[in-house]
């Protein structure tokens, strides 16, 4: 099939002890090899501070996944989801202050 | 099918800087990793670094500082320079593509390596 | 950084034998460990990711194994053109360190 661009959604969790979880959902992508990786400062986090999810279909002949890592309540803007899929790639950042929901789909 | 291409000096002052030039063709660099690894003669695999799709670029710290990785997308062409060189740098140096899905990151695809040596 | 320790730096074997290769870190890197085979001549080819999973066109005779800190990668039936160098390769944490390598040699 032809080429299926991810949407890009980053959430964050309520506070725990001055931490949160900051996850980065792609769906609807196709082919199912994606990259998808917290950076802090532009830097890749190592993968015993992430958490990913199975690479799995989402019934509609796409696929759909997530990482997820914890980070320091305050330090948000200094962590960005970054994604690669077919030859094209992007980067996203925590939403700030109250906005809870950031999406982008690429293209 | 993906192939990667070392180009080197062969032979460096020590002192001077090193510049490789990667060449790969069979995909993009704007949507994968490509990665550094040097081998000393007689010695084992070190990484050096490596660059993603969009420019960024990850570095070994203990490199870091004599370190720069870039590329030219168009030109499927990864580029590694390293400054201030010594004996010690001598090796054969490889670029590896890097495929990074979710809890897998390997590098998949290796050049056959360029050997640089580092001598007066 | 990591320390990747291989205790057996060459060892020999005769065509048909079982040979396992060890590989030790020092912290649990949760089997985020890849394997790699540098023939004589320099040629390096993955042979291993994710500690056990195989990537397309390695023969079946090769098998990785583990968790924790301790791995292994078995050949099952040693064959001529498995006369190399091996390494493991951890990625847990950056930088990714390798192994000092195991070589393989005939009898």
């Known amino acids: 099939g032809s080429t299926v661009p991810p949407m890009v959604n980053v959430t964050c969790s309520e506070v725990s002890e001055g931490n949160i979880t900051v996850t980065c959902r792609a769906s609807s992508f196709y082919p199912r090899n994606i990259t998808l990786t917290w950076r802090q400062d532009g830097v890749s986090l190592s993968h015993n501070t992430q958490q990913w999810g199975d690479v799995l279909p989402d019934g509609n002949g796409t696929y759909q996944t997530w990482v997820a890592t914890r980070i320091r309540q305050g330090e948000e803007q200094r962590f960005t989801c970054y994604m690669e899929h077919s030859g094209n790639h992007g980067t996203h950042p925590v939403p700030s202050g109250n906005s809870h929901h950031h999406h982008h789909h690429h293209h | 099918q993906v192939q990667l291409k070392e180009s080197g000096p062969g032979l460096v002052a020590p002192s001077q800087s090193l510049s490789i030039t990667c060449t790969v063709s069979g995909f993009s660099l704007n949507g994968q990793g490509v990665n550094w690894v040097r081998q000393p003669p007689g010695k084992g695999l070190e990484w050096l670094g490596m660059?993603?799709?969009?420019?960024?670029?990850d570095y070994n710290s203990a490199l870091k500082s004599r370190l720069s990785i870039s590329k030219d997308n168009s030109r499927s062409q990864v580029f590694l320079k390293m400054n201030s060189l010594q004996t010690d740098d001598t090796a054969r140096y490889y670029c590896?593509?890097?495929?990074?899905?979710?809890?897998?990151?390997?590098?998949?695809?290796w050049g056959a390596g360029t050997t640089v040596t580092v001598s007066s | 950084d990591i320390q990747m320790t291989q205790t057996t730096s060459s060892l020999s074997a005769s065509l048909g034998d079982r040979v396992t290769i060890s590989c030790s870190a020092s912290?649990?890197?949760?089997?985020?460990l890849n394997w790699y085979q540098q023939k004589p001549h320099g040629t390096v080819k993955l042979l291993i990711y994710?500690?056990?999973s195989l990537p397309s066109g390695v023969p079946s005779r090769f098998s990785g194994s583990g968790s924790g800190t301790d791995y292994s990668l078995t050949i099952s039936n040693l064959e001529p053109e498995d006369i190399a160098s091996y390494y493991c390769?951890?990625?847990?944490?950056?930088?990714?360190?390798f192994g000092g390598g195991t070589k393989v040699e005939i009898k």
């Open positions: 390769q951890q990625y847990s944490k950056l930088p990714p360190t």
């Open positions: 590896a593509r890097g495929a990074h899905y979710g809890k897998r990151w390997y590098f998949d695809v």
């Open positions: 912290q649990n890197i949760n089997n985020y």
């Open positions: 660059i993603w799709g969009d420019g960024s670029t």
């Open positions: 994710y500690t056990s």
